[in-house]
Amino acid sequence: VPPGEDSKDVAAPHRQPLTSSERIDKQIRYILDGISALRKETCNKSNMCESSKEALAENNLNLPKMAEKDGCFQSGFNEETCLVKIITGLLEFEVYLEYLQNRFESSEEQARAVQMSTKVLIQFLQKKAKNLDAITTPDPTTNASLLTKLQAQNQWLQDMTTHLILRSFKEFLQSSLRALRQM
């Protein structure tokens, strides 16, 4: 159930509507719940979650990561720079979320929910950002060839890639929400 549509919300018509920040917070937590469910299936299906061979698969990936220069940590915190990084990072993750779509058996709907909820989150955040010009959108052609390359990997690498995407996306969202809670 997407945020704002659970029975508690229906049963409390007199509650104040969520602010934009509260809505973003709730949306990220909803996505984190989805990632947890997907990670459960991944970890149950293979031993990737305990593997020490992550570096082999990471060579093929360029997953977004928070760095000091992005302005999202306490030292050098910069609201606008950080917001641009969060939105840019989420846009870059979209191709990897597309890759995840055919990677799950029992959690297929959950994978779709994570993907769609991320699109909604990006829209929420774009409304919050003042400097939309600074946000670079990934090139569709580059994304298409990356997707083809990832899908052409052997089974072991595909499993490892799935694990790494979920782990990195979770960490990126956690760092993003930590920073957003300071704004």
Epitope: I28, L32, F73, Q174, L177, R178, R181, Q182
Partner: nanobody, 124 residues
């Protein structure tokens, strides 16, 4: 939810040091964001510091920055608060808190598990 137990509080003179510990039961400690809050007599509970799961993202309240250091040991399921250059205004009950989403932040509502607290008294 996890169980949290604070220890290390006590009476110390101004300028002195104390190290608080927060021991957490449960195998999922390493996925939690952890925080320290404090409540002085007659005041509301306030944020002190918090730390993410792998210690690379730490925030401090302005009032303790440069004096207090938060850290964690995921192998031992323990979080610490090293308090140096203590002042009388640091006197409070110190609580540790855990956020199962691994996010944390400066508000009480972001945390879903709390310890009972440990008393810190700084005399002048």
């Amino acid at each position: 939810q996890v169980q949290l137990v604070e220890s290390g509080g006590g009476l110390v003179q101004a300028g002195g040091s104390l190290r608080l510990s927060c021991t957490v039961s449960g195998r999922t400690f390493s996925t939690y964001a952890m925080g320290w809050f404090r409540q002085a007599p007659g005041k509301e509970r306030e944020f002190v510091a918090d730390i993410n799961w792998n210690s690379d993202n730490i925030w401090y309240a302005d009032s303790v920055k440069g004096r207090f250091t938060i850290s964690r040991d995921n192998a031992k399921n323990v979080m610490y608060l090293q308090m140096n250059s203590l002042k009388p205004e640091d006197t409070a009950v110190y609580y540790c808190a855990a956020d199962s989403y691994g996010v944390g932040g400066g508000k009480e509502e972001y945390y879903d598990s709390w310890g009972q607290g440990t008393q810190v008294t700084v005399s002048s």
